[in-house]
């Protein structure tokens, strides 16, 4: 039976350019974690595997950093990096547990700024 | 270098048994999943069985299950497919492979022929 | 059992071509489908895994795209040594199965 909840930092937002820590954290059961997979939108992120360590997908390796422990760390971010994001918590017995992120990247307060105090 | 060297194969009657090896080398055996996969003479490709590395948990195709049984001995970086109550249509070169992340199979062994025949 | 349906199964083609190979899964399989080249009295050599990513090694005219049930396999300029039989997997659930495969042939 599985008694295990995932909780998840919920709905972000970020800047533009800067970078955000997606955390996921699995409660209320002795299951063994033994891989993290880390996705967005039907592709894969990275992958934390109990023996293997981490793994980063080639097309993200330059903008994606792994940790906070079990956690991913997304850089340089893009208005295209608005989305769910879902950390699958693969686990021995209990099976995989789900979590759900929803990133919003919003324009820099700078580039706000700017468009609103433009002089006339 | 990752070497995958898979043994055992041969010529059996139907109803016989086989246990095939794989002796692995140039990485940390114990820490990746590993699976058997067949390929009938001028056939594609059948997954047979896998074993994850920590918890050794196994899964089987149902062509095979209840006759085949995978096991590992991480301490002799080898794995095993004991077959039992082969049949005709068990005829293949059996390939020994690894499953890094559980998700992609990233080398393969050379294989080892299966003949079941009277 | 999550079938995968690979097409063509064969096809003719010239050092240069651009070709196209797809695998489609009978139910939603996010990105877990990866691709194998085959050549004759050879082991499978991964190519392309988790639906995009290239295999360390394997050469750049290789690429990979889709996601949920239909993948492509892309040759952006056939080689003569890139002849050869190629199949999709699945690895989203147990039993992994795999397409029937697709022989690329000199035309």
């Known amino acids: 039976m599985m008694t295990g909840t995932i909780e998840t930092t919920g709905n972000i937002s970020a800047e533009k350019g800067g970078s955000i820590i997606l955390q996921c954290h699995l409660s209320s059961t002795t299951a063994q974690v033994t891989q993290v997979n880390w996705e967005q939108q039907d592709q894969l992120l990275a992958i934390c595997n109990a023996d293997l360590g981490w793994h980063i997908s080639p097309s993200f390796k330059d903008r994606v950093a792994p940790g906070p422990g079990l956690g991913l760390t997304l850089q340089s971010l893009t208005v295209n990096d608005t989305g769910e994001y879902f950390c699958i918590y693969h686990t021995y017995p209990d099976g995989t547990y789900t979590g759900r992120i929803f990133l919003e990247v919003l324009e820099s307060s700078v580039a706000e700024h700017g468009a609103r105090f433009q002089i006339p | 270098e990752v070497q995958l060297l898979e043994s055992g194969g041969g010529l059996v009657q139907p109803g016989g048994s086989l246990r095939l090896s794989c002796a692995a080398s140039g990485f940390t055996f114990s820490s990746y999943a590993m699976s058997w996969v067949r390929q009938a003479p001028g056939k594609g490709l059948e997954w047979v069985s896998d074993i994850k590395s920590s918890a050794g948990s196994t899964s089987y195709a149902d062509s095979v299950k209840g006759r085949f049984t995978i096991s590992r001995d991480n301490s002799k970086n080898t794995l095993y497919l004991q077959m039992n109550s082969l049949r005709a249509e068990d005829t293949a070169v059996y390939y020994c492979?690894?499953?890094?992340?559980?998700?992609?199979?990233?080398?393969w062994g050379q294989g080892t022929l299966v003949t079941v025949s009277s | 059992d999550i079938q995968m349906t690979q097409s063509p199964s064969s096809l003719s083609a010239s050092v240069g071509d651009r070709v196209t190979i797809t695998c489609r899964a009978s139910?939603?399989?996010?990105?877990?489908v990866n691709w194998y080249q085959q050549k004759p009295g050879k082991a499978p050599k991964l190519l392309i895994y988790a639906a995009s990513s290239l295999q360390s090694g394997v050469p750049s005219r290789f690429s990979g795209s889709g996601s949920g049930t239909d993948f492509t396999l892309t040759i952006s300029s056939l080689q003569p040594e890139d002849f050869a039989t190629y199949y999709c997997q699945q690895s989203y659930s147990t039993p992994l199965t795999f397409g029937g495969g697709t022989k690329v042939e000199i035309k």
């Open positions: 139910q939603s399989i996010s990105y877990y």
């Open positions: 492979a690894r499953v890094p992340y559980s998700v992609w199979i990233d080398y």
